[in-house]
Interface confidence: low
């Protein structure tokens, strides 16, 4: 699932990782745009083992994965919330 959240909360990520996470381990991706109390964009990956990892938005692998998911989602679901299982 790819989700874009607009939230009034402050930054959620304490620590970010750029380490690649294989798609088969990913259950859901949340994107929190910059603003609303947080000066940076945040990407939160929910893994199938229930752990959560904050991913560096500059990491190439997450940018590529999000682009693929956006293309798959844009024809069926409206922005800003995408709900789509990652195959």
């Amino acid at each position: 699932v790819l989700e874009v959240y607009y939230t009034s909360l402050r930054c959620r990520c304490v620590q970010e990782s750029s380490v690649f996470i294989p798609r088969r381990f990913i259950d859901r991706i949340q994107i929190l745009p910059r603003g609303n109390g947080c000066p940076r964009k945040e990407i939160i990956v929910w893994k199938k083992n229930k752990s959560i990892v904050c991913v560096d938005p500059q990491a190439e692998w997450i940018q590529r994965m999000m682009e693929v998911l956006r293309k798959r989602s844009s024809s069926t679901l409206p922005v800003p919330v995408f709900k789509r299982k990652i195959p």
Epitope: R12, C13, V14, Q15, S17, S18, V19, I21, E42, I44, W46, K47, K50, S51, I52, V53, C54
Partner: antibody
Framework: EVQLQESGPGILQPSQTLNLTCSFS??????????VGWIRQPSGKGLEWLAH???????RYNPALKSRLTISKETSKNQVFLKIANVDTADTATYYC???????????????WGQGTTVTVSS | DIVLTQSPASLAVSLGQRATISCRAS??????????MHWYQQKPGQPPKLLIF???DLESGIPARFSGSGSRTDFTLTVNPVETDDVATYFC?????????FGGGTKLEIK
């Protein structure tokens, strides 16, 4: 404010089933990412993780005890239950209910604990 | 299962001095750049209290005298300077792999 409170029978006999209840407030198990678990501690000894249940009803058990454990939840009542079948004196311990942290980056440490309920298995 | 070995089992430290507790894991508890190792303090008759999460992050409300470090298999909890209120048993816990496991505990006393 997050609060958890355990309740149990206090004393029971070997081979009986132990029924524990965790009643909590300050959060909901319907919230994405929430989890509640059980940990026990024999008097003067270490901590042992037993089981936990997530908002989506995913249940995790300690493999060493899995055949005897059943965890469940009543989301609307803010309660989580643990059953331990066929208890023995080795199950004598303080049983703690814990909330698994719902913070981003990782949420699998035990941020909140109940005061614990003491269970004695004796014939 | 990942076995966590704490050392020493007990230690006595003078007030104002540094206490160092070690936790060694039988295999790495790191995943995606994060160390899934956490530290708790337990006083007699009380439930454990979270001190440090993800190896080095200080829980809200915990004094900065407590600090954590380490990665992969070797982790350390440091209390500096030690105060009377720190007399307790300290446990490490890993959550990188099921079943989540705890160390055997280290009892801190004042010399």
């Amino acid at each position: 404010e997050v609060q958890l409170q355990e309740s149990g029978p206090g004393i029971l006999q070997p081979s009986q089933t132990l029924n524990l209840t965790c009643s909590f407030s300050g959060f909901s198990l319907s919230t994405f990412g929430m989890g509640v678990g059980w940990i026990r501690q024999p008097s003067g000894k270490g901590l042992e993780w037993l089981a936990h249940i997530w908002w989506d009803d995913d249940r995790r058990y300690n493999p060493a005890l899995k055949s005897r454990l059943t965890i469940s939840k009543e989301t609307s009542k803010n309660q989580v239950f643990l059953k331990i079948a066929n208890v023995d004196t080795a199950d004598t311990a303080t049983y703690y209910c814990t909330r698994i942290a719902g913070y981003y980056g990782s949420r699998d440490w035990f941020a909140y604990w109940g005061q614990g309920t003491t269970v004695t298995v004796s014939s | 299962d990942i076995v966590l070995t704490q050392s020493p089992a007990s230690l006595a430290v003078s007030l104002g001095q540094r206490a160092t507790i070690s936790c060694r894991a039988s295999e790495s508890v790191d995943n995606s750049g994060i160390s899934f190792m956490h530290w708790y303090q337990q006083k007699p008759g009380q439930p454990p209290k979270l001190l440090i999460f993800r190896a080095s992050d200080l829980e809200s409300g915990i004094p900065a005298r407590f600090s954590g470090s380490g990665s992969r298999t070797d982790f350390t909890l440091t209390v500096n300077p030690v105060e009377t209120d720190d007399v307790a048993t300290y446990f490490c816990q890993q959550s990188n792999k099921d079943p989540w496991t705890f160390g055997g505990g280290t009892k801190l006393e004042i010399k």
